[in-house]
């Protein structure tokens, strides 16, 4: 056979020869020859390779460092890396999730629009007219003002975005 200039998918060219790449989860031990196939070995414990490859070393699984607020979301295999996420109340600082920060709280006058997850922070929104939030919280939404009318009461003090209305008894008409 004539020496090839290009190789098929899942092959690589070396010494004018097409050799098979190692499958995911295995690393290259020795290139193929005219007499032998590519020699590959499975990655060790806590190692992985996620593509068809000619790597001589497997990659180490990511370490989810609890000191950085991280925990394992999905354990790595010989073909996949470990996926980290953050402890309850924390979220990742980047897509790679290499460290965590405490979820942000929404200040008084703001309510939670979207509760934080392991990968996204709390999203706050200002309380619109008719709603209020009087606490700093990572969970509480804006609450609607109390409806004095339904309680047969009248508004004694108007509500704000930080305070509820104050209801009081209606003034009796004197005879």
């Amino acid at each position: 056979p004539e020496p090839p200039t290009a190789c098929r998918e899942k092959q690589y060219l070396i010494n004018s020869q097409c050799c098979s790449l190692c499958q995911p989860g295995q690393k290259l031990v020795s290139d193929c020859t005219e007499f032998t196939e590519t020699e590959c070995l499975p990655c060790g414990e806590s190692e992985f390779l996620d593509t068809w490859n000619r790597e001589t070393h497997c990659h180490q699984h990511k370490y989810c460092d609890p000191n950085l607020g991280l925990r394992v979301q999905q354990k790595g295999t010989s073909e996949t890396d470990t996926i980290c996420t953050c402890e309850e109340g924390w979220h990742c600082t980047s897509e790679a999730c290499e460290s965590c920060v405490l979820h942000r709280s929404c200040s008084p006058g703001f309510g939670v629009k979207q509760i934080a997850t392991g990968v996204s922070d709390t999203i706050c929104e200002p309380c619109p007219v008719g709603f209020f939030s009087n606490v700093s919280s990572a969970f509480e939404k804006c609450h609607p003002w109390t409806s004095c009318e339904t309680k047969d009461l009248v508004v004694q003090q108007a509500g704000t975005n930080k305070t509820d209305v104050v209801c009081g008894p209606q003034d009796r008409l004197r005879a």
Partner: antibody
Framework: EVKLVESGGGLVKPGASLKLSCAAS????????ISWVRQTSDKRLEWVAS????????YYPDNVKGRFTISRENAKNTLYLQMSSLKSEDTALYYC??????????WGQGTSVTVSS | DIVLTQSPVTLSVTPGDSVSLSCRAS??????LHWYQQKSHESPRLLIK???QSISGIPSRFSGSGSGTDFTLSINSVETEDFGIYFC?????????FGAGTKLELK
């Protein structure tokens, strides 16, 4: 028609040397790796040596390394096996075989080597 | 070294029988295994490559299967010309090694 013809076998004493040849025809010799394989009297096959198509890479099992040398002359379409420090356990029928897609796709008829005092 | 164990050592059959010859590797070799046939007073000839790929000029009654460590050569309806020794050979890593062979003989 692919043809491989071995020659050079014979009866030698332990410690002696012998050079085997394999004449190839019917294919582009310089495009193929070639191996030597031997067959003992109990019919077992044992790989002895291999050489790449260009002659730049050679391979041996541990039991013949340092004693046997495989070589080729592409201009003459000929393969060689220089054997030295021969032992009685080297007694066998020696075949040359062409490597096609990593398989020994064509074999010669063999040449007999006997090592005995 | 990768050791190839062939079984049975001898198989006595009648023409027309269908048979299976086994070759087991001491470690995984994917599909990096060839089968050879050697008739009496002849050189070996390639029968099956890469565990299951057929060879031009070899009758279709010969087929191979298996991957990893366990391989099988099947002969569908043995003919008299099939008697001889069958060898498996691995090319997964150096040194190249052969099985000790299975002798197919007339019952």
């Amino acid at each position: 028609e692919v043809k491989l013809v071995e020659s050079g076998g014979g009866l030698v004493k332990p410690g002696a040397s012998l050079k085997l040849s394999c004449a190839a025809s019917g294919f582009t010799f310089s495009n193929y790796g070639i191996s030597w394989v031997r067959q003992t009297s109990d019919k077992r096959l044992e790989w002895v040596a291999s050489i790449s198509s260009g002659g730049d890479n050679t391979y041996y099992p541990d039991n013949v390394k340092g004693r046997f040398t495989i070589s080729r002359e592409n201009a003459k379409n000929t393969l060689y096996l220089q054997m030295s420090s021969l032992k009685s356990e080297d007694t066998a029928l020696y075949y040359c075989a062409r490597a096609g897609e990593k398989a020994m796709d064509y074999w010669g008829q063999g040449t007999s080597v006997t090592v005995s005092s | 070294d990768i050791v190839l164990t062939q079984s049975p050592v001898t198989l006595s059959v009648t023409p027309g029988d269908s048979v299976s010859l086994s070759c087991r590797a001491s470690q995984t070799i994917n599909n990096n295994l060839h089968w050879y046939q050697q008739k009496s007073h002849e050189s070996p000839r390639l029968l099956i490559k890469y565990a299951s790929q057929s060879i031009s000029g070899i009758p279709s009654r010969f087929s191979g299967s298996g991957s990893g460590t366990d391989f099988t050569l099947s002969i569908n309806s043995v003919e008299t010309e099939d008697f001889g020794i069958y060898f498996c050979q691995q090319f997964s890593s150096w040194p190249l090694t052969f099985g000790a062979g299975t002798k197919l003989e007339l019952k």
